[in-house]
């Protein structure tokens, strides 16, 4: 006899990094017919929804209208289906940003390159932090982690034209509390025609939109589950 | 921005019973999620009860279940908890509160964690001696 429900997937919506002061939406989604939703908080109860009616409702909404260091952490669902739970989601990385200051974001041997020439991003924050984020804006979400006292390299080896794109960074002053994002640089990598043609660019962020790039959802992170389970919320584990 | 007033504390004898009453002003209380806390002599902040802006969904903490009844009247813009069947472990300061107001939330949502609110009154001194 079965003894727990499959567990339901939990996702933030627009984003799971959110700008401080900002509002974000945490999302549940079980199974028709659960009568009880719980959402955890660094394994304490943090709020309850029981859907009504039941039967029409698979996914239930937590609001957080002013993100702050004390929400950021880590998140899970449960829900319940008659007396019989379900298992806990994933873990869902809440990480709040614009903390403090911005760190400056530059690039070795500059931001044209030609390729299989080496690049090395070099992030720098002079404040108390040890840890750095270096992310390629686009749907790929692509995140490396660097520490440096107040400077991280981020070398890319090698680069070919699928590196190209544009590059921002953050420090982190704990796995959940991340700086301001520096300016963008956008690398620019050049190859012979057909190369260039056969690796377009990733989708990015139009360049006046990254103020507010929590405010637009993702469709591809953030409604396909199992890539949001396995690999934007790896860089926290 | 909502202010939030709690009043009906006292001393009251083992076994007996106080409504609390907070009584909020602004004019999006109604939409708003809110919850009961208590803060015992020399001890954290704890969690007592929670109801949706609707007023359709109620959670308590295990050791208040059945004993005491949160409620509100939107109409009002005021929330109470009606205890019942006090004990001297029920001491407190008893506080209402209320969660940030730029957010839509379900009718049937409840919040049980302090974190989540935004808003705070100064407390009511609850005291239950013989």
């Known amino acids: 006899q079965q003894q727990t429900l499959p567990k339901p997937f939990i996702w933030a919506e627009p984003h799971f990094m959110v700008p401080k002061e900002k509002q974000v939406t945490i999302c549940c989604q079980g199974n028709y017919g659960a009568v009880e939703y719980q959402l955890h908080f660094e394994g304490s109860l943090f709020a309850v929804d029981r859907p009504k009616p039941p039967e029409r409702i698979n996914k239930v909404q937590f609001y957080i209208p002013d993100m702050n260091s004390r929400m950021a952490g880590q998140y899970s669902c449960i829900y319940r289906v008659g007396e019989l739970w379900s298992e806990p989601s994933n873990l869902l990385d809440l990480v709040v940003t614009e903390m403090y200051d911005t760190p400056t974001l530059s690039v070795h041997p500059g931001p044209e390159v030609i390729s299989g020439e080496k690049v090395t991003f070099y992030c720098r924050l002079d404040t108390a932090t040890s840890m750095f984020l270096l992310l390629k804006e686009g749907r790929s979400s692509h995140v490396q982690r660097g520490y440096g006292k107040v400077q991280a390299e981020f070398p890319l080896g090698p680069v070919t034209t699928a590196h190209r794109g544009t590059y921002r960074c953050f420090g982190s002053y704990n796995n959940h509390a991340w700086s301001f994002p520096s300016e963008p640089v956008k690398l620019l990598v050049t190859g012979d025609i057909e190369n260039t043609s056969l690796a377009p660019e990733d989708p990015t962020f139009p360049a006046d939109t990254w103020g507010t790039y929590l405010l637009t959802t993702e469709t591809g992170l953030q409604k396909d589950h199992a890539l949001w389970d396995h690999t934007a919320q790896n860089l926290l584990r | 921005e909502v202010q939030l007033v709690e009043s009906g504390g006292g001393l009251v004898q083992p076994g007996g019973s106080l409504r609390l009453s907070c009584a909020a002003s602004?004019?999006?209380?109604?939409?708003?999620?809110m919850a009961w806390f208590r803060q015992a002599p020399g001890k954290g902040l704890e969690f007592v009860a929670a109801?949706?802006?609707?007023?359709?969904?109620?959670y308590y903490a295990d050791s208040m279940k059945g004993r005491f009844t949160i409620s509100r009247d939107n109409s009002k813009n005021t929330a109470y908890l009606q205890m019942n069947s006090l004990r001297a472990e029920d001491t407190a300061v008893y506080y209402c509160?209320?969660?940030?107001?730029?957010?839509?939330?379900?009718?049937?949502?409840?919040?049980?964690?302090?974190?989540?609110?935004?808003?705070w009154g100064q407390g009511t001194l609850v005291t239950v001696s013989s």
């Open positions: 509160a209320a969660v940030g107001d730029s957010a839509p939330y379900s009718a049937t949502i409840v919040y049980t964690d302090a974190r989540a609110y935004a808003y």
């Open positions: 602004g004019r999006t209380f109604s939409r708003l999620p």
């Open positions: 109801i949706s802006w609707s007023g359709g969904s109620t």
